[in-house]
């Protein structure tokens, strides 16, 4: 049984300074661990690249809203 206490923590130390088109984004996850120096969002792009972004920025919040809405729409 793995020890959760020793589980690795992903942190973001730098944020992208470029706005990413929502068409390029597939998903996101939040970094809220107190072990990290910054609260962050990690976007995963449609080509599986992970990008750290600042959750205080409006384009980041709007992108999260867009991706959230997609989760309630059945994929066909």
């Amino acid at each position: 049984q793995p020890d959760a206490i020793n589980a690795p923590v992903t942190c973001c130390y730098n944020f992208t300074n470029r706005k990413i088109s929502v068409q390029r984004l597939a998903s996101y996850r939040r970094i809220t661990s107190s072990k990290c120096p910054k609260e962050a969002v990690i976007f995963k792009t449609i080509v599986a690249k992970e990008i750290c972004a600042d959750p205080k920025q409006k384009w980041v919040q709007d992108s999260m809203d867009h991706l959230d809405k997609q989760t309630q729409t059945p994929k066909t």
């Epitope: 205080k56 980041v60 919040q61 809203d65 959230d68 809405k69």
Partner: nanobody
Framework: EVQLVKSGGGLVQAGGSLRLSCAAS????????MGWFRQAPEKEREFVAL????????FYSNSVKGRFTISRDNAKNTVYLQMNSLEPEDTAVYYC????????????????WGQGTQVTVSS
């Protein structure tokens, strides 16, 4: 982490109104999707309403649609639930929650929860 402090519950007669508010502190409020959930005695916790970070999108459960209104004031770090035309079936403990993870109305995508406030609707 986010702390959520609730106010506005109480006892009201059927047909009456109540307004719940939930003030957040600790993190960037505008970066969280906010939701309200409720749990009636002997029942599971159920989704009530949510509002997007921008406030531009709201979503309601069928049981409260047209009677409840969710809103937020990002300048005041506060989310509200205006409850009108209350029915005895609305009696429950109401929780506000901050959604950090990608999702919609699923409780599992809400990371931070308020303590809950009792709403009792008498017939």
């Amino acid at each position: 982490e986010v702390q959520l402090v609730k106010s506005g519950g109480g006892l009201v007669q059927a047909g009456g109104s109540l307004r719940l508010s939930c003030a957040a502190s600790g993190r960037t409020f505008s970066s969280y999707r906010m939701g309200w959930f409720r749990q009636a005695p002997e029942k599971e916790r159920e989704f009530v309403a949510l509002i997007s970070r921008s406030g531009g999108t709201t979503f309601y459960s069928n049981s409260v649609k047209g009677r409840f209104t969710i809103s937020r004031d990002n300048a005041k770090n506060t989310v509200y639930l205006q409850m009108n035309s209350l029915e005895p079936e609305d009696t429950a403990v109401y929780y506000c929650a901050a959604g950090a993870q990608m999702g919609w109305a699923e409780a599992s995508t809400y990371d931070y929860w308020g303590q809950g406030t009792q709403v009792t609707v008498s017939s």
